[in-house]
């Protein structure tokens, strides 16, 4: 039977080294055996490159394409092939479809004056355009109470958040995770970082009386 694409490729770039495209076939497909995604930068002399897709689900394919350090002018021509059959053709401009890398190394440290200091690493080297463009969202949630969660927007430069222990329940276990986005690139949010967990041992003031 003929091979058909149900949902055409949707692509995002981390704007440093990788672009990822995902699409859905109309029936379960062995992506790596049956399909190829070719990509070529629209630039004089560029070569055609081939990406071998992997299965994310039965009928969902994903291709990770190594790209050079992206610049705004870059536009790629994409062609999805099943053998000699062209299933889909389109173009992709990484600067218009940015999904930042996930922030790393999230840690929680006790700080002065009953505060917690949450720290993480900017996933981009200083020379990359996105390094100074990221803002963050930190999600703090009570491990035993799904209703007890807080969201903090970190819009200043440093990858840190100071959290008053008094804003959290004493003796409760909390988890935090962080994600990033780049406003000037109108990016999507990055994936969430792995969670880090700690015990909030702050003693409310009333207990001192």
């Amino acid at each position: 039977g003929s091979v058909k694409v149900l949902h055409e490729p949707s692509c995002f770039s981390d704007y440093i080294s990788t672009s990822v495209c995902q699409w859905k076939m109309d029936h379960p497909t062995n992506c790596s055996a049956e399909l190829r995604l070719s990509y070529q930068l629209d630039f004089m002399g560029s070569e055609n490159h081939t990406c071998v897709p992997e299965n994310r689900e039965d009928s969902v394919c994903v291709c990770s394409m190594p790209i050079d350090d992206a610049v705004e002018a870059d536009v790629y021509q994409l062609d999805l092939w099943a053998g000699q059959q062209l299933l889909w053709s389109g173009s992709f401009q990484p600067s218009k479809h940015v999904k930042p890398r996930t922030p790393g190394n999230l840690t929680v440290h006790p700080n002065i004056s009953h505060t917690w200091l949450l720290m993480w690493t900017n996933p981009y080297p200083t020379e990359n355009h996105l390094h100074s463009e990221l803002t963050y969202m930190v999600n703090v949630s009570n491990d035993n109470d799904p209703e007890d969660f807080k969201v903090y927007n970190v819009t200043y430069m440093g990858p840190t958040l100071r959290l008053a222990a008094s804003t959290l329940k004493s003796g409760a276990s909390y988890s935090a995770r962080v994600r990033a986005w780049a406003q000037t690139y109108n990016s999507t949010w990055s994936d969430w970082s792995p969670s880090t967990t700690w015990l909030n041992y702050y003693e409310p003031w009333e207990q001192h009386l």
């Epitope: 930068l41 004089m44 002399g45 560029s46 070569e47 055609n48 490159h49 050079d68 610049v71 705004e72």
Partner: antibody, heavy 125, light 112 residues
Framework: EVQLVESGGDLVKPGGSLRLSCVAS????????MTWVRQAPGKGLQWVSL????????YYADAVKGRFTISRDNAKNTLYLQMNSLRAEDTAVYYC??????????????????WGQGTLVTVSS | DIVMTQTPLSLSVSPGETASISCRSS???????????LDWYLQKPGQSPQGLIY???KRASGVPDRFSGSGSGTDFTLRISRVEANDTGVYYC?????????FGQGTKLEIK
């Protein structure tokens, strides 16, 4: 030492054909795009054609499009220019030159960093 | 197509002086910040052309630092300081950004 040696230039009648060759040495030929540039007697330089490292993509000046074909044999480190339907205005010294490195996703550009000595093509009846 | 225009078309300079050649393109040659696809070439009498400057300002291998390129977008300049007799020849600018590649008309440099 990086070197390019052209050959194949000759006197040919209008409407005739000729094939120029350019043998490369001293660098990884398949990693680089190659270009032909010509120079009519007493005139300036005119770009003719470019081919990328794999040979999969070619580009031509309007003046030669449909008449000239650029190709390469990476196993022989050789660049070619097949010239058909030649005209008097094609009379020129033809140079081959090493162009951008196309092995990377975005070609690395160094200009036309090595040129051959040139081969003379004369189209006259 | 991108049209390249050089000025002046001829130039006479005394040894030790500085020579400047201008090149203007009909479209911007900037692909991204710092990447201007503009080259300078020298063709000495009876010889093949040789590369001097690429990407607007980078000197080709073996080119003395007396040769410098500057500019961005559509306006570029080649400067040759402390001109020597050996610098005589025709200087060409060329855009390498898009097909068809194109050269300027050439500037003939004569040493007095």
């Amino acid at each position: 030492e990086v070197q390019l040696v052209e050959s194949g230039g000759d006197l040919v009648k209008p409407g005739g054909s000729l094939r120029l060759s350019c043998v490369a040495s001293g660098f990884t030929f398949r990693d680089y795009a190659m270009t032909w540039v010509r120079q009519a007697p007493g005139k300036g330089l005119q770009w003719v054609s470019l081919i990328n490292g794999s040979g999969g993509k070619t580009y031509y000046a309007d003046a030669v499009k449909g008449r000239f074909t650029i190709s390469r044999d990476n196993a022989k480190n050789t660049l070619y220019l097949q010239m058909n339907s030649l005209r008097a205005e094609d009379t020129a010294v033809y140079y081959c030159a090493v162009d951008r490195k196309t092995k990377t996703i975005r070609p690395q550009y160094y200009g036309l960093w090595v040129w051959g000595q040139g081969t003379l093509v004369t189209v006259s009846s | 197509d991108i049209v390249m225009t050089q000025t002046p078309l001829s130039l006479s300079v005394s040894p030790g002086e500085t020579a400047s050649i201008s090149c203007r393109s009909s479209q911007s040659l900037t692909y991204s910040i710092g990447y201007n696809y503009l080259d300078w070439y020298l063709q000495k009498p009876g010889q093949s052309p040789q590369g001097l400057i690429y990407l607007g300002h980078k000197r080709a291998s073996g080119v003395p630092d007396r040769f410098s390129g500057s500019g961005s977008g559509t306006d570029f300049t080649l400067r040759i300081s402390r001109v020597e007799a050996n610098d005589t020849g025709v200087y060409y600018c060329m855009q390498g950004l898009q097909s068809p590649l194109s050269f300027g008309q050439g500037t003939k440099l004569e040493i007095k």
